[in-house]
């Protein structure tokens, strides 16, 4: 009897981007004839079917429509390729194709994982006290969350606060805080991709004497 | 065998409009994205658009969005690409690809190209 | 749109000489496609999906990257690899091509 095979290890997309995801039949075996069953995470939730030698779309999930295309061009030889249009975050997590004749069915599973690289940080001063200089660090757009970090002039980790929140899409902006005092020298901002090993980083000079201390006359006529 | 074959050479006027074929066979071309790349002389690959033939959806590159319209008609396995208000910069070999399932790294690519239309625009 | 840029534009290379083309892309992708076209011909597939050689492709060439840096590697120049290559991105719309590297034999 033959198995089903689908992707071997995970699949990447970003953000935006189009996935593709292969299944075929070993040894080849004519699939024409067979129902081919795109699924996400269970059985009954179709992101594709084809069925009785056609695509059948109103079966699929609402999320779905419009997205997908079953490439047939080798399902002779069993072999179905998915492609999936404009990968959102929502579309990561687990998915099979299950391929069934009459008498006889095989799956596979494997996972989509879906990255997004967020924006290069935007470093500012919220705040000047005693001359302690209050630095805010921004990134927006990232998928799944980044480590944010700030880092001291020669690299080292420097303590920080920070806030995370989830836009309408489901992607992660960031941002951290830090206190330093006006000599700091050479400070980075870091927010780092787990999945990608990307990184991107700003940097800001804090000098000694960041504020220039300023003398107010009173003008009077 | 897949094969895709491309209608012949065309010299038309400035302003004209033209529609160039793309007849398939070895496969149908409503399994597959069948897409048009223009190259013009002595330059490289440019995208031009693609089609789904199994619904007519079509996306296109921007800077051609005004001047190509892509169609097929999955009955003669053909996909066609019609292009208005032809300038000389219009100038260029037309070929048409199929975008086929690949079945290693899970991804899919123009495996198939068409030998190219030759277009040229004078006057 | 996606930016690819390739370097260099134009390279010769020596019977056996290892040879690298590079193709950086202004914003993350997935995958790179890399196309193959020699003067008077319709271009071909060369490499897919970053790292898969098309069917025929000698296994003297190879295809490595990620994000915005890929590139396609021949292990010892040949004569029959005298060719245009261009970098092509399948993961947006619109997709995109490199400007291309033309590699010529010495």
């Known amino acids: 009897q033959w198995q089903v095979f689908g992707p071997d290890k995970p699949v990447q997309a970003l953000v935006g981007e189009d996935a593709a995801f292969s299944c075929f039949l070993s040894p080849k075996t004519n699939a024409e004839a067979m129902e081919v069953r795109f699924f996400r995470g269970q059985f009954s939730s179709v992101v594709h079917l084809y069925r009785d030698g056609k695509d059948q779309p109103f079966m699929q999930m609402p999320q779905y429509q419009g997205r997908t295309k079953l490439v047939k061009d080798s399902i002779a030889e069993g072999r179905i390729s998915l492609r999936l249009e404009n990968i959102t975050v929502l579309d990561a997590g687990l998915y099979g194709c299950r391929i069934s004749s009459q008498s006889y069915y095989q799956k596979a599973i494997w996972e989509l994982q879906v990255s997004a690289l967020g924006s290069v940080p935007l470093i500012s001063i919220t705040g000047y006290v005693d001359r302690d200089i209050q630095l805010l660090c921004q990134s927006s757009g990232w998928f799944p969350r980044p480590t944010a970090k700030w880092k001291g002039p020669q690299g080292q980790d420097l303590s920080t606060d920070s806030r995370t929140n989830r836009d309408m899409h489901g992607l992660f902006d960031v941002e951290i805080s830090l206190t330093v005092q006006e000599n700091a020298g050479s400070i980075s901002c870091s927010m780092r991709h787990a999945h990608l090993s990307r990184e991107v980083e700003s940097r800001v000079q804090i000098g000694d004497t960041f504020f220039e201390p300023i003398s107010w006359h009173l003008a009077t006529k | 065998e897949v094969q895709l074959q491309q209608s012949g050479a065309e010299l038309v006027r400035p302003g004209a409009s033209i529609k160039l074929s793309c007849t398939a066979s070895?496969?149908?071309?409503?399994?597959?994205?069948m897409h048009w790349v223009r190259q013009r002389p002595v330059q490289g690959l440019e995208w031009i658009g693609r089609?789904?033939?199994?619904?007519?959806?079509?996306n296109f590159a921007p800077k051609f969005q005004d001047k190509a319209t892509i169609t097929a008609d999955t009955s003669s396995n053909t996909a066609y690409l019609q292009l208005s208000s032809l300038a000389s910069e219009d100038t260029a070999v037309y070929y048409c690809?199929?975008?086929?399932?690949?079945?290693?790294?899970?991804?899919?690519?123009?495996?198939?190209w068409g030998q190219g239309t030759s277009v040229t625009v004078s006057s | 749109q996606i930016v690819l840029t390739q370097s260099p534009a134009i390279m010769s290379a020596s019977p056996g000489e290892k040879v690298t083309i590079t193709c950086s892309a202004r914003?993350?992708?997935?995958?790179m496609q890399w196309i193959q076209q020699k003067p008077g011909t319709s271009p071909k597939l060369w490499i897919y999906?970053?790292?898969n050689l098309a069917s025929g492709v000698p296994d003297r060439f190879s295809g490595s990257g990620s994000g915005t840096s890929y590139s396609l590697t021949i292990s010892r120049m040949e004569a029959e690899d005298a060719a245009t290559y261009y970098c092509?991105?399948?993961?947006?719309?619109?997709?995109?091509f490199g400007g291309g590297t033309k590699l010529e034999i010495k």
């Open positions: 092509q991105q399948r993961s947006r719309y619109p997709r995109t």
């Open positions: 999906s970053t790292s």
């Open positions: 089609i789904d033939p199994a619904n007519g959806n079509a």
């Open positions: 690809t199929r975008e086929g399932g690949l079945y290693y790294g899970n991804s899919d690519a123009m495996d198939y």
């Open positions: 070895g496969f149908n071309i409503e399994d597959d994205y």
């Open positions: 914003s993350s992708v997935s995958y």
